[in-house]
Amino acid sequence: AFGISGVQKYTRALHDSSITGISPITEYLASLSTYNDQSITFALEDESYEIYVEDLKKDEKKDKVLLSYYESQHPSNESGDGVDGKMLMVTLSPTKDFWLHANNKEHSVELHKCEKPLPDQAFFVLHNMHSNCVSFECKTDPGVFIGVKDNHLALIKVDSSENLCTENILFKLSET
């Protein structure tokens, strides 16, 4: 549905989006897995958390993440199509006081301990570009998504509409 540089165009206004209210519209505890059904797991190592993408053994318990959903408002003069638009943004917290953060300089996804209000690096625009899968786009870096690289989460630049459905940026949410 995009032109040549569609991803850059449609995300241009993300920098200026304002999150309406400080409380989430809903929260949802779910396990996170890749399109290929590998689990996203979190391990405490040397007083910091590491994020892994791995196959779990049968009956091994999946790690849960608290997804907090916020509504973000675009005034029509920013949305580019004359319409006041709304989007869903999420924060992801696998354990109390820790949130996934986008480290745009290192192209990495990290767990940081922080207090509310959370920094913009902890917010991701929610997409469901593929049936029953979601993608997470950095609020601070439009066109950059959480993805899987070398069995870790990383930030992946998506430079064309075709790549929006590339499997390594697609995730499944499950309550089980």
Epitope: A1, F2, G3, Y28, M87, L88, L126, C165
Partner: antibody
Framework: QVQLQESGPGLVKPSETLSLTCTVS????????VHWIRQPPGKGLEWLGV???????SYNSALMSRLTISEDISKSQVSLKLSSVTAADTAVYYC???????????????WGQGTLVTVSS | DIQMTQSPSSVSASVGDRVTITCLAS??????LAWYQQKPGKSPKLLIY???RLADGVPSRFSGSGSGTDFTLTISSLQPEDFATYYC?????????FGQGTKVEIK
Amino acid sequence: QVQLQESGPGLVKPSETLSLTCTVSGFSLSKYGVHWIRQPPGKGLEWLGVLRAGGTISYNSALMSRLTISEDISKSQVSLKLSSVTAADTAVYYCARDHYYYSSFGGFASWGQGTLVTVSS
Amino acid sequence: DIQMTQSPSSVSASVGDRVTITCLASQTIGAWLAWYQQKPGKSPKLLIYAATRLADGVPSRFSGSGSGTDFTLTISSLQPEDFATYYCQQLNSTPYTFGQGTKVEIK
């Protein structure tokens, strides 16, 4: 303002292909998904499929073998084709736009007025 | 597919009455439920999204509650223009199924 307008023949013969077009204005297909929904006379609503903002398409599996959804960005149009129709496909067909940018979680905020398609010989 | 069961299928009420419509999902859908109002010969109109959020321009007498599998639409004080059919819809996973509808009629 946001508008969606369905158009196409009101009468289709059994075994033929039903073709409808949804012409949109006031918003961009690169930001919002457009869905097709139908409603047989006197009955409830049935979701048929969606053209998502990224250009991917999801179908109702019950109709997947007969249904094709496509787009023409330059004309701001989304098309629906339903093949091998029978009398059971007689319905008002609606197109509708997502409430949220990039996702369908917020339901359908804007609807076309609907177009009645009758399948009869 | 997720089945959505609405009850009652119809309700007779008077202006000023409080009306409650319930929707039950066959599996958990989080908060991803919408409610629509449809009048004869018209397109559906979004009333509530994300289970509890009031859509733009919808009067505050409409409210939504619930999460997981059980959801409720409440009209606190029924007005003449509220006589219509109401549908719930789950948006957690495709196909995005609707309830069968609840017709609110004049008593």
